[in-house]
C-alpha cells in the first residue's frame, strides 16, 4: 500500500535537520512526505506545540496523472534572525483522516558570543557617594562570566572572579568610564562604555549671617567636589508670602526665582534688592567644571522691618485764635514695614524742642494757652514702624504769636486728647 495509508506507517520521507548558530542567523528547516490522495496541510511544531504564525511554505508535486496517485509534499520553515525564543525541538505534523503523524525531530540551538540583556548606563553621581552599576549577559553557551573595567582597567584578576551582575562603587573623586566584558566558550563581547560624571556634593548648612530690610547675607558649607574645584555657587530666592508653603524637597516654586551667582570662596553672598519685612525661601547649588550639584532644600528666611524711607507728605500748619491745626498724609516713600504711627515735634525760637506721639491719626489740634509771644514756631512730623522713626519732614512754620507773652512755648501749646511726650530731640 502507498505511504501514509496504513496505520502507524509514517508518511515522512525527510525530517527536519539541526541548526546551531549565533543570534541573528537565518536558517531553514525542511521536511518531506509522500501521501496517497489529496495532500494534507503540513503544520510545524516547536517543543510539541503547533506554531500558529510559522513562516512556512508548502510545495506539492503529483507523482502520477490521477488525483488518487501519490504526492510529494515539501514544507520549509524559515527562521529569520535567530533568537533564544526560537530554540527547541522542531517537528512536522500532518492530519490524515483521523490519524496524526509527527516527523522525527530536528533541533535549533543558539550558540555564539554572549548577548547583553543589560548594560551599564551613563549617570551623574555626587563626589565620594556610593552607587551601583548593572550588567547582564547570556549565552548559550553558558556559563557567561563578567569582568568589569574602570577606565579600561579590569577590576578583577579574571572573568567571573569579581562582581558579576551588579558593581558596587563606594565613591569616585573624578569622572570615570565603566564597561563590562562578557566571556563564554565562544569568545568575548564588550558592553557599551558608561560615563559616570562626578558632580559636587550638595552644599550643607545654608544659613543667615545677617539681615537688613532689603538684603540678606547668607553662607553655606560646600560639599566635596572630587578633583574638580568649585567654579561658583548659585543662590535662588523666591517670595513665599503667597501661602505656597514650600516644603523641604518639594517641587520648584511656580514664580521666577531671583538668581545670584557667588564666586567661591568665600561661600557667602549678599542678596540685595529684596522687599523689607517679607518672607522668602532660599536655596543654593555649587558648580564645578563637571556640572552643578543638586540644590539644597528650600530654607525659609525673612527680611526684617525697616524705617519709613520718606517723611509724611503735604503737611499743613494753620492757626485759628487759640488753636493751631496740623494735618499731613502718609509718606509716599516705602514704609518698609507696618506703620505704627507718627511723631510730631515743635519748637519756638530759643525754646527747647517738644516731641509728641500722635498714633495713627493724620491730624492734631494744638490748644494755645495764655497770650505769650513765641516767635518762629515750627512743626515737623515723622512716621515710624517697629524698626524706628523715618526721616522728619522739613520744618513747617506757624504764624508768630503776639508780643508780650512770656510763658514757655511748651506750656502755651496744649493737645488735650493725647498725653504729650517731651524729650530733647536727638
Amino acid at each position: 500500500a502507498p505511504r501514509g495509508t496504513q496505520a502507524e506507517e509514517s508518511p515522512f520521507v525527510g525530517n527536519p535537520g539541526n541548526i546551531t548558530g549565533a543570534r541573528g542567523l537565518t536558517g531553514t528547516l525542511r521536511c518531506q512526505l509522500q501521501v496517497q490522495g489529496e495532500p494534507p496541510e503540513v503544520h510545524w511544531l516547536r517543543d510539541g506545540q503547533i506554531l500558529e504564525l510559522a513562516d512556512s511554505t508548502q510545495t506539492q508535486v503529483p507523482l502520477g496523472e490521477d488525483e488518487q496517485d501519490d504526492w510529494i509534499v515539501v514544507s520549509q520553515l524559515r527562521i529569520t534572525s535567530l533568537q533564544l525564543s526560537d530554540t527547541g525541538q522542531y517537528q512536522c505534523l500532518v492530519f490524515l483522516g483521523h490519524q496524526t503523524f509527527v516527523s522525527q525531530p530536528g533541533y535549533v540551538g543558539l550558540e555564539g558570543l554572549p548577548y547583553f540583556l543589560e548594560e551599564p548606563e551613563d549617570r551623574t553621581v555626587a563626589a565620594n557617594t556610593p552607587f551601583n552599576l548593572s550588567c547582564q549577559a547570556q549565552g548559550p553557551p553558558e556559563p557567561v562570566d563578567l569582568l568589569w573595567l574602570q577606565d579600561a582597567v579590569p577590576l578583577a584578576t579574571a572573568p567571573g572572579h569579581g562582581p558579576q551582575r551588579s558593581l558596587h562603587v563606594p565613591g569616585l573623586n573624578k569622572t570615570s568610564s565603566f564597561s563590562c566584558e562578557a566571556h563564554n566558550a565562544k569568545g568575548v563581547t564588550t558592553s557599551r562604555t558608561a560615563t559616570i560624571t562626578v558632580l559636587p556634593q550638595q552644599p550643607r548648612n545654608l544659613h543667615l549671617v545677617s539681615r537688613q530690610p532689603t538684603e540678606l547675607e547668607v553662607a553655606w558649607t560646600p560639599g566635596l567636589s572630587g578633583i574638580y574645584p568649585l567654579t561658583h555657587c548659585t543662590l535662588q530666592a523666591v517670595l513665599s508670602d503667597d501661602g505656597m508653603g514650600i516644603q523641604a524637597g518639594e517641587p520648584d516654586p511656580p514664580e521666577e526665582p531671583l538668581t545670584s551667582q557667588a564666586s567661591v570662596p568665600p561661600h557667602q553672598l549678599r542678596l540685595g534688592s529684596l522687599h523689607p519685612h517679607t518672607p522668602y525661601h532660599i536655596r543654593v547649588a555649587c558648580t564645578s567644571s563637571q556640572g552643578p550639584s543638586s540644590w539644597t532644600h528650600w530654607l525659609p528666611v525673612e527680611t526684617p522691618e525697616g524705617v519709613p524711607l520718606g517723611p509724611p507728605e503735604n503737611i499743613s500748619a494753620t492757626r485759628n485764635g487759640s488753636q493751631a491745626f496740623v494735618h499731613w498724609q502718609e509718606p509716599r516713600a516705602p514704609l518698609q514695614g507696618t506703620l505704627l504711627g507718627y511723631r510730631l515735634a515743635y519748637q519756638g525760637q530759643d525754646t527747647p524742642e517738644v516731641l509728641m506721639d500722635i498714633g495713627l491719626r493724620q491730624e492734631v489740634t494744638l490748644e494755645l494757652q495764655g497770650d505769650g509771644s513765641v516767635s518762629n514756631l515750627t512743626v515737623c512730623v515723622a512716621a515710624y514702624t517697629a524698626a524706628g522713626d523715618g526721616p522728619w519732614s522739613l520744618p513747617v512754620p506757624l504764624e508768630a504769636w503776639r508780643p508780650g507773652q512770656a510763658q514757655p512755648v511748651h506750656q502755651l501749646v496744649k493737645e488735650p486728647s493725647t498725653p504729650a511726650f517731651s524729650w530733647p530731640w536727638w
Epitope: 496505520a7 502507524e8 509514517s10 496541510e41 503544520h43 511544531l45 510539541g48 506545540q49 503547533i50 500558529e52 517537528q91 505534523l93 492530519f95 483521523h98 490519524q99 496524526t100 503523524f101 509527527v102 516527523s103 522525527q104
Partner: nanobody, 127 residues
Framework: QVQLVDSGGGLVQAGGSLRLSCATS????????MAWFRQAPEKVRDFVGF???????LYDDSVKGRFTISRDNAQNTVYLQMNSLKPEDTAVYYC?????????????????????WGQGTQVTVSS
C-alpha cells in the same frame, strides 16, 4: 492551569436540537485539536468528532449529517450543534483538547490522545 468549560446540555425531545459550547480562557483553541466525546451510563467514552487547528473536521459515522462542529477563535470557543436528536444520543458530552504533539503516530478518535478535558454536560433525549 488549562480549564475547559462545557455547557449547553439539557432535556430535549427526540427530533429536537441542542448546541453545546466548550470555552477556555487560558490557551487558544486555534492552535489545538478540539474534540467531542460522549459517555452513556455503563458505557465507554465514545468519539463524536474533532476539528483541527487548520479547520479539518472528522465525525463518527453515528452522528455524520446530524452533528456539526465549529470554532470561534475570537471567543476561544468550540461548538457542537446537534440536530435530529435520538434517544440513543443520551449521554454526558465532554469536550477535549490536544495542544501537544510529540509521538510519531496517533489516532485522534482515541480519548487517550487528549491532554485536557471539560467537566461534561448532560444531554437527555426523551422519546
Amino acid at each position: 492551569q488549562v480549564q475547559l468549560v462545557d455547557s449547553g446540555g439539557g432535556l430535549v425531545q427526540a427530533g429536537g436540537s441542542l448546541r453545546l459550547s466548550c470555552a477556555t480562557s487560558t490557551r487558544t483553541v486555534s492552535s489545538a485539536v478540539m474534540a467531542w466525546f460522549r459517555q452513556a451510563p455503563e458505557k465507554v467514552r465514545d468519539f463524536v468528532g474533532f476539528i483541527t487547528n487548520s479547520g479539518n473536521i472528522l465525525y463518527d459515522d453515528s452522528v455524520k449529517g446530524r452533528f456539526t462542529i465549529s470554532r470561534d477563535n475570537a471567543q476561544n470557543t468550540v461548538y457542537l450543534q446537534m440536530n435530529s436528536l435520538k434517544p440513543e444520543d443520551t449521554a454526558v458530552y465532554y469536550c477535549a483538547a490536544k495542544w501537544s504533539f510529540s509521538s510519531g503516530y496517533g489516532d485522534l478518535r482515541r480519548a487517550a490522545m487528549y491532554d485536557y478535558w471539560g467537566q461534561g454536560t448532560q444531554v437527555t433525549v426523551s422519546s
